[in-house]
Interface confidence: medium
């Protein structure tokens, strides 16, 4: 299970029309359930029970988004309409380009995803968890526009991290 | 059919009190956020507050005019959002409208056809 | 707290382009989201996420958002495109809801 290196950068634009760009670093690990590939895109938050319909929800955003979904403690959902397998499967057949779970309540998840899929998925699926989650989870719950650049070295830069 | 009703509008005298209840069928209710939104006459729209799941917290979070006036609650069991309005003002007149927003975006895909309430003397 | 600004008018002719603009200070970092309202009804949700259409909103409808300006472009607008039309974002300091003042699109 290999580190995932991910960048968070969250777009301020200013009155003047530029923008100004905030970047904060995390690290998650690489599933079995996805490949080991460096992705980039616009953060798209999911709900886990949002990937669950096939209804107009489907095909909502153009392809090339990164999915971010908080998993939720077991006993909230007991019956899950998918496994977090299929999930991932979901989001990237709506067209993300990454899948990443915030896996802190629900460690299980963990397991589910590194079980050596015959069939892997060709884009990459990462979990996080931790301060690594709470820091990529602020960020995301800002609703403001921001991408995610999920690498599997270290950048190579050296990047300014802000704290969110 | 996804729909949202709301009910429980009417003429009531300032500093008085009224409870609107908003009835949600169509979809599973407890999975949703929802707002409350309301349209004084030839007026625009104005955010009034908001419900989270019961799943993300239940937090409920209001806008500056009717903080500490107002009460949003809901009952996953009946399917029923219910905005708790004491201490009506003139200036709350309207047209109130419940709203479902697509998860994790405060977009509103979803609303219902409106309660009008009159606060006159 | 941010403020959305629309222009209170706009006009166009059938088959026409519209374009409904709503101005705020770094709106550009912000999801903007679209409503159509017709008299005596409830809004509609045309836009959300700057540029994402709802299923059954037509083709016509779309969005965009860049530095201090969200706009709703309607191509080859329709009589029943006559409407009001609200932008609206989502302001995390504190959370609430912010609407722009609404533009009312005539159908000449």
């Known amino acids: 299970k290999e580190t995932a290196f991910v960048e968070v950068v969250l777009f301020e634009s200013s009155p003047s029309g530029d923008y100004t760009t905030y970047t904060t670093g995390l690290t998650g690990r690489f599933s079995r359930a996805g490949a080991t590939l460096s992705a980039e895109g616009e953060i798209v938050q999911m709900h886990p029970l949002g990937l669950c319909n096939n209804n107009d929800e489907e095909d909502l955003y153009e392809y090339g988004w990164v999915g971010v979904v908080k998993l939720e403690q077991p006993e909230l959902d007991p019956k899950p309409c998918l496994t977090v397998l299929g999930k991932a499967k979901r989001a990237v057949q709506r067209g993300a380009t990454a899948v990443i779970f915030d896996v802190s309540e629900n460690p299980e998840a963990i397991d589910q995803l590194n079980q050596g899929s015959e069939d892997p998925l060709k884009r990459p699926v990462v979990y996080v968890k931790g301060a690594d989650a709470i820091k990529l989870m602020n960020i995301v719950n800002k609703q403001k526009v921001a991408r995610a650049r999920i690498q599997h070295r270290p950048p190579r830069q050296p990047t300014e991290y802000f704290d969110m | 059919e996804v729909q949202l009703v709301e009910s429980g509008g009417g003429l009531v005298k300032p500093g008085g009190s009224l409870r609107l209840s908003c009835a949600a069928s169509?979809?599973?209710?407890?999975?949703?956020?929802i707002h409350w939104v309301r349209q004084a006459p030839g007026k625009g729209l104005e955010w009034v507050g908001r419900?989270?799941?019961?799943?993300?917290?239940?937090?409920?979070e209001y806008a500056a005019p009717v903080k500490g006036r107002f009460t949003i609650s809901r009952d996953d069991s009946k399917n029923t959002l219910y905005l708790q309005m004491n201490s009506l003002k003139t200036e709350d007149t309207a047209v109130y409208y419940c709203a479902r927003a697509i998860y994790y975006l405060e977009a509103f895909d979803v609303w219902g056809q409106g309660t009008l309430v009159t606060v006159s003397s | 707290d941010i403020e959305l600004t629309q222009p209170p008018s706009v006009s166009v002719s059938p088959g026409q382009t519209a374009s409904i603009t709503c101005s705020g200070d770094s709106l550009g970092s912000y999801y903007v989201h679209w409503y159509q309202q017709k008299p005596g009804q409830a809004p509609v949700l045309v836009i959300y996420r700057n540029k994402q259409r709802p299923s059954g909103i037509p083709e016509r409808f779309s969005g965009s958002n860049s530095g201090n300006t969200a706009t709703l472009t309607i191509s080859g607008t329709q009589a029943e495109d006559d409407a009001d039309y609200y932008c609206?974002?989502?302001?995390?300091?504190?959370?609430?809801?912010?609407f722009g003042g609404g533009t009312k699109l005539t159908v000449l």
């Open positions: 609206a974002v989502w302001d995390d300091e504190p959370h609430h809801d912010v």
């Open positions: 169509g979809f599973t209710f407890s999975d949703y956020g």
């Open positions: 419900i989270k799941s019961k799943t993300d917290g239940g937090i409920t």
